[in-house]
Amino acid sequence: DAHKSEVAHRFKDLGEENFKALVLIAFAQYLQQCPFEDHVKLVNEVTEFAKTCVADESAENCDKSLHTLFGDKLCTVATLRETYGEMADCCAKQEPERNECFLQHKDDNPNLPRLVRPEVDVMCTAFHDNEETFLKKYLYEIARRHPYFYAPELLFFAKRYKAAFTECCQAADKAACLLPKLDELRDEGKASSAKQRLKCASLQKFGERAFKAWAVARLSQRFPKAEFAEVSKLVTDLTKVHTECCHGDLLECADDRADLAKYICENQDSISSKLKECCEKPLLEKSHCIAEVENDEMPADLPSLAADFVESKDVCKNYAEAKDVFLGMFLYEYARRHPDYSVVLLLRLAKTYETTLEKCCAAADPHECYAKVFDEFKPLVEEPQNLIKQNCELFEQLGEYKFQNALLVRYTKKVPQVSTPTLVEVSRNLGKVGSKCCKHPEAKRMPCAEDYLSVVLNQLCVLHEKTPVSDRVTKCCTESLVNRRPCFSALEVDETYVPKEFNAETFTFHADICTLSEKERQIKKQTALVELVKHKPKATKEQLKAVMDDFAAFVEKCCKADDKETCFAEEGKKLVAASQAALGL
């Protein structure tokens, strides 16, 4: 349905408030270093222009594409060259190359100051003084730090952010009310950003087919009662939504996501029995709820898959006629029967099935060749099962902090070239799999753990892609999306690594560590642990444990001392000497 004016169409569909918010997010995700005020000015200009197009769709420039309109607007920024360097060269290009150029310059790790939370009273005053600016600032700060954040979902976060301040700034104990809510939003926001980053990486690095396969598997687990045709329709629509958001087309993305939620709710009888509550909510909550809805119960009587996918004499005929449809049906049928498998495992099984058919359908006796195909699945299923069992046992034995430390050591030995902050961030997140997933019964552990690990390892991949330093990381990240985790798991100690020169400065600590939160203190200790392993990659667990125990005792002792700074200086020298001796440095 072609519209004379795309900008007018989206303005009318979304309404002014959502339109302005989405344009702000889009601009902040592209120009991550621009001041807030500059972005607000650009957004207001675009909004005023959109209103003229709503009044008269034939008005000048109203027929231009959104990429053209937004790109032209971004290219009016005076400081583009000095702030962004070569990104300014994008402005010399025509659409669609210009937008592709902007996308390529999105920075997953922008050099921006950490967001420091002001005092509660200060925040409440700012909220009451100018609620609109306060909420816009939230969108801006999140969007520029997370350039792939799922825009319609960010609107949902902003709505919850506003609700938290509305409620808590009137409460007797503002801090007790507000801070837990802000912590929850922060943690959920980071998780949401990382999950979306994987979807965009899947689309951009591995293509639409890879994303569609992921979506078939996940939606079939979630909606096992839905017919294959229904799941296929949802997959097609969902792919369009995420392609748009990952491509910076945030207005189209939000509009199409709303349409998809509407369709799902209108057809819930043929999709899932679990959607009723979601579909009674307002739009933003509804879309979020549908995205998180629990798996429906499996139909009572699903037959074995052998008949259609192994025993049938028509397997090769059906495969040859429509390969992706047949493989899609295989994936759908397997996934709806296995909510206990991770999506990546299901995709590995489908890939094995595809490879077998490719080989066997060209053989003299195809049926004889593929008859034992599902015997090949056994090791693929058992590998993640065993890995999760071992790691959950380790987590239960060590607790989260020490489990993270074990992973820090493991991953630093595998890929010691990776920067220390990245190793700390990724290993800490990998370690959270324990508290997130090990509490679940066996039937829910694998989908929880392995699909979460896919999200975390994608963080490593996108951060490493910015400044590649390890061929092993590049190999694991680029060869196969579904085999990333097994690829990293299989890495042994990097024998080619030349240990880092010892630098006492790295292990010199000051009294300011005492004022840090427990989490920040842990990060400092874990940073030191990574550096230790980089100096001495062959250090044993026992050696590292001894040094880390000494280090913890040293911090505790000096933080209790009257003259903390002197304690850190004197005891620090002793600790460094003792650590060098213990590790044979």
């Epitope: 909510p339 206990d340 599902f374 056994k378 058992e382 066996e442």
Partner: nanobody, 124 residues
């Protein structure tokens, strides 16, 4: 947790019949695919038969098709294997298994719970 206990095994002559039972406790079996496997002396465990949750679908290994019948009574929380026209090569330890999620009924990795087994000996 589902506990499975097999019974009904024994010694029988070639051509004879036996009916194995698999009684489940700890959970209702109506949400599980039930299967029978066997291990002959010195051989690997092999699939025999399986039945879907409601009993609407049954699936057999080629070697037992037409001779063995799998059934279930969800109200009694029990699965059965009726074995007719028994042969010496059917001699094995027979295991009952329950799988909450199952795509390939014939694959042991698809089953979550296993019994200890009941011995069937076919000999003249």
């Amino acid at each position: 947790e589902v506990q499975l206990v097999e019974s009904g095994g024994g010694v029988v002559q070639p051509g004879g019949s036996l009916r194995l039972s698999c009684a489940a406790s700890g959970s209702t079996i109506s949400s599980y695919v039930m299967g029978w496997f066997r291990r002959a002396p010195g051989k690997e465990r092999e699939f025999v038969a399986a039945i879907s949750r409601s009993g609407g679908y049954t699936y057999y290994a080629d070697s037992v098709k037409g001779r063995f019948t799998i059934s279930r009574d969800n109200s009694k929380n029990t699965a059965y294997l009726q074995m007719n026209s028994l042969r010496p090569e059917d001699t094995a330890l027979y295991y009952c298994a329950a799988g909450r999620y199952s795509a390939w009924y014939s694959q042991s990795y698809e089953y979550d719970y296993w019994g200890q087994g009941t011995l069937v000996t076919v000999s003249s």
